[in-house]
């Protein structure tokens, strides 16, 4: 690829690159659906080293519309040249190829969590990969949101060291018998547009009930 | 080779906007960063933002967002920065500059705009 | 935000004579993938900048090899062998390793 040449392919694709579960995760789409590959494979080399394009192992000939890079990309300055190309059979469909840099491109998508409900509390337990890189960590905050009756609360538990194991935050000074719901998401240092998972909700019991609610998935 | 030509010198009106341009020449717009630079006059130098003029994403210093907005035209090789509600503290010349094969490390840049904040 | 400190703040020097600025860092600039993102520009008197050098130590083409950078970590370094007329107007360095990125004040040569 001649990076100061017209550019290599035409945009027939759209990528997105996300920190998933702490993974890097490239996702794409095709611009025109009548094109229906049987599958892909996705290559990619680093602009400040022009070498031969890389086949990504996990991503040759793959029937997926989504390749895991964490154990590749791993510099957030780097621009990383990518190209996918579509192959019907053994017929190439097309090629269409993106420059990503971690630190602009990268979104961030919420962590898996469960909620549970007691009388006048919610635990909230967040689940994290048991390690994380350090390059992965992108100075990123976990946000608790509580909603209860139009009115959104948002916490912002302090995380000792990295993003790893499980976290329980309790939600606490809550009204028994009320019904409340909760959003977990990940704050970026910069405030991109962030991705907030879908509400998790609880009724909590009375208050002369001591035993836990069940959370509603 | 590769240039970046800014557009023409700006007098404008407090409370209004302005919208500098960088057209983009000499390398494949989509596949390189472009960055915004801010210098007020006899001071040094500040960074206001990045672009992916490939994907549209961008990257704002805290201290310019709501102020600076930056998008990329790539039919055009155009990147443009959009300044809103503008005080005397925003009269000042306005550098976009090219990223190397690196974030961060701007290797070519434009001749600068001029912008004064005067009513 | 990164603060850079650079010293002095003018430096006045006999063409053929050697320069050195200083460029101190309030945090480490050594990122996580080993690189270190600190670069020097030149602004010359009425122009846009110029960068000079780029990963401490690299020199842009076209940069007389008259130009060296060095350091790491917090502490940096431009050195011009020997000056040369051409080579007055300000120099910055900044680093593009933590966002903000930010730059140092600025060192003014003047040829004596």
């Known amino acids: 690829i001649s990076y100061d040449s017209p550019d290599y392919t035409d945009e027939s694709c759209t990528f997105k690159i996300s920190l998933r579960n702490f993974r890097s995760i490239l996702s794409w789409e095709l611009k025109n659906h009548s094109i229906v590959p049987t599958h892909y494979t996705l290559l990619y080399t680093i602009m400040s080293k022009p070498e031969d394009l890389k086949v990504v192992k996990n991503c040759a000939n793959t029937t997926r519309s989504f390749c895991d890079l964490t154990d590749e990309w791993r510099s957030t300055h780097e621009a990383y040249v990518t190209v996918l190309e579509g192959f019907s059979g053994n017929t190439t469909l097309f090629s269409c190829s993106h420059n990503f840099w971690l630190a602009i491109d990268m979104s961030f998508e919420p962590p898996e969590f469960e909620i549970v409900g007691f009388t006048n509390h919610i635990n909230v337990m967040v689940k994290f990969p048991s390690i994380v890189e350090e390059e992965l960590q992108f100075d990123l905050s976990l946000v608790i949101e509580e909603q209860s009756e139009g009115i959104v609360k948002k916490h912002k538990p302090e995380i000792k060291g990295n993003m790893s194991g499980n976290f329980t935050y309790i939600i606490d000074k809550l009204i028994p018998n009320t019904n409340y719901c909760v959003s977990v998401y990940l704050e970026h240092s910069d405030e991109q547009a962030v991705i907030k998972s879908p509400l998790k909700c609880t009724l909590l019991p009375p208050g002369q009930e001591s035993e836990s609610a069940e959370s509603a998935k | 080779q590769v240039q970046l030509q800014q557009s023409e010198a700006e007098l404008v009106r407090p409370e209004t906007s302005v919208k500098v341009s960088c057209k983009a020449s000499?390398?494949?717009?989509?596949?390189?960063?472009i960055e915004w630079v801010k210098q007020r006059p006899g001071q040094g130098l500040e960074w206001i933002g990045v672009?992916?003029?490939?994907?549209?994403?961008?990257k704002y210093n805290e201290k310019f967002k709501g102020k600076a907005t930056l998008t990329a035209d790539k039919s055009s090789s155009t990147a443009y920065m959009q300044l809103s509600s503008l005080t005397s503290d925003d009269s000042a010349v306005y550098f976009c500059?090219?990223?190397?094969?690196?974030?961060?490390?701007?290797?070519?840049w434009g001749q600068g705009t001029s912008v004064t904040v005067s009513s | 935000d990164i603060v850079l400190t650079q010293t002095p703040l003018t430096l006045s020097v006999t063409i053929g004579q050697p320069a050195s600025i200083s460029c101190k860092s309030s945090?480490?600039?050594?990122?996580?993938?080993?690189?270190?993102?600190l670069n020097w520009l030149l602004q010359r008197p009425g122009q846009s900048p110029k960068r000079l050098i780029y990963?401490?130590?690299k020199l842009d083409s076209g940069v007389p090899d008259r130009f060296t950078g060095s350091g790491s970590g917090t502490d940096f370094t431009l050195k011009i062998s020997r000056v040369e007329a051409e080579d007055l107007g300000v120099y910055y360095c900044?680093?593009?390793?933590?966002?903000?990125?930010?730059f140092g004040g600025g060192t003014k040569l003047e040829i004596k």
């Open positions: 000499g390398y494949s717009f989509r596949n390189y960063l």
């Open positions: 672009i992916n003029p490939g994907s549209g994403n961008t």
């Open positions: 990963l401490v130590s």
């Open positions: 945090q480490s600039l050594l990122d996580s993938d080993g690189k270190t993102y």
């Open positions: 900044w680093q593009g390793t933590h966002f903000p990125y930010t």
């Open positions: 500059a090219r990223d190397g094969y690196y974030l961060g490390t701007m290797d070519y």
